[in-house]
């Protein structure tokens, strides 16, 4: 029985050119995490394997950095990065847990609306 829950950073609004951290945390289970996949739509961004470590997809190598922890740092954000990101936890013996984070990347001019941008 799958008892775990995934907590995420929550949805994020950020400014074009900035960087953000996507993080998920699996709790309420003793299952062993064997691998975490980070995906956007149907694209694989990165894998963190318990034995093999990190692998960043070649097309994202310039803008994606592993960590902190099992999280992912997205840099040099573009408006095209707007979308839903998935952290997929592969565990044993529970199976797969998925967390979802929506990232909205805005042009700087939108700051006129008073939106508070997050740039770590």
């Amino acid at each position: 029985m799958m008892t775990g829950t995934i907590e995420t950073t929550g949805n994020i609004s950020a400014e074009k050119g900035g960087s953000i951290i996507l993080q998920c945390h699996l709790s309420s289970t003793t299952a062993q995490v064997t691998q975490v996949n980070w995906e956007q739509q149907d694209q694989l961004l990165a894998i963190c394997n318990a034995d093999l470590g990190w692998h960043i997809s070649p097309s994202f190598k310039d803008r994606v950095a592993p960590g902190p922890g099992l999280g992912l740092t997205l840099q040099s954000l573009t408006v095209n990065d707007t979308g839903e990101y998935f952290c997929i936890y592969h565990t044993y013996p529970d199976g797969t847990y998925t967390g979802r984070i929506f990232l909205e990347v805005l042009e700087s001019s939108v700051a006129e609306h008073g939106a508070r941008f997050q740039i770590p």
Epitope: E7, T8, T9, G10, N11, I12, S13, I20, I21, Q23, Q41, V79, N80, T82, G83, E84, R100, I101, F102, E104, L106, V110, H113, A115, R116, F117, Q118, P120
Partner: antibody
Framework: EVQLQQSGPELVKPGASMKISCKAS????????MNWVKQSHGKNLEWIGL????????SYNQKFKDKATLTIDKSSSTAYMELLSLTSEDSAVYYC????????????WGQGTSVTVSS | DVVVTQTPLSLPVSFGDQVSISCRSS???????????LSWYLHKPGQSPQLLIY???NRFSGVPDRFSGSGSGTNFTLKISTIKPEDLGMYYC?????????FGGGTKLEIK
């Protein structure tokens, strides 16, 4: 002036599929997400999902993942929601609503499309 | 999914009254960068819903200052001072911090 004009009411048979349109005007269509909301029994509101006109990306409430398909036609600034394999549970008013940038909310709503599923 | 609980379900008022509507979430609506995405809407009979408050406490353009929002974390409040006839209808809160977005069950503001 921001306007979202939805297609008219529909009476459809169980098992059928249908598509609702939402024509946007008065703003840059590709600059804002388009959200869809279901209102059942004149009360409860449920977020179905959104589409990003800029890149075609979508985000669905998993409850509606196999029920609704969101698409857009950039050339006509129109968003569409197709409802699949309709049952009486799908009888409701459906709204399109423009995303409010930077705040994960919606600021302008269409007038709603009433869908009645009945044999 | 985040459960959003609104109270009361029904709120009988007299014109000129001040009222509060509460919205509570099953988990914190503050994201890792300190932003909280909680908005309020009014749905009048025969109309589309309209945005009143976004980001907890920001009034949308054209919304009278008798509407105010407050709160943090999991507890939020919409206050309406000096109720007017055009304020009657269903009020909903919406959390947009976590996927999927979820609405409160609604509060009906009606005349006593």
């Amino acid at each position: 002036e921001v306007q979202l004009q939805q297609s008219g009411p529909e009476l459809v048979k169980p098992g059928a599929s249908m598509k609702i349109s939402c024509k946007a005007s008065g703003y840059s269509f590709t600059g804002y997400t388009m959200n869809w909301v279901k209102q059942s029994h004149g009360k409860n509101l449920e977020w179905i999902g959104l589409i990003i006109p800029y890149n075609g990306g979508t985000s669905y409430n998993q409850k509606f993942k196999d029920k609704a398909t969101l698409t857009i036609d950039k050339s006509s600034s129109t968003a569409y929601m197709e409802l699949l394999s309709l049952t009486s549970e799908d009888s409701a008013v459906y709204y399109c609503a423009r995303g409010f940038r930077g705040y994960f909310a919606v600021d302008y709503w269409g007038q709603g499309t009433s869908v009645t599923v009945s044999s | 999914d985040v459960v959003v609980t609104q109270t009361p379900l029904s709120l009988p008022v007299s014109f000129g009254d001040q009222v509060s509507i509460s919205c509570r979430s099953s988990q914190s609506l503050t994201n890792s960068y300190g932003n909280t995405y909680l908005s309020w809407y009014l749905h009048k009979p025969g109309q589309s819903p309209q945005l009143l408050i976004y980001g907890i406490s920001n009034r949308f353009s054209g919304v009278p200052d008798r509407f105010s929002g407050s709160g943090s974390g999991t507890n939020f409040t919409l206050k309406i001072s000096t109720i007017k006839p055009e304020d009657l209808g269903m009020y909903y809160c919406l959390q947009g911090t976590h996927q999927p977005w979820t609405f409160g069950g609604g509060t009906k503001l009606e005349i006593k």
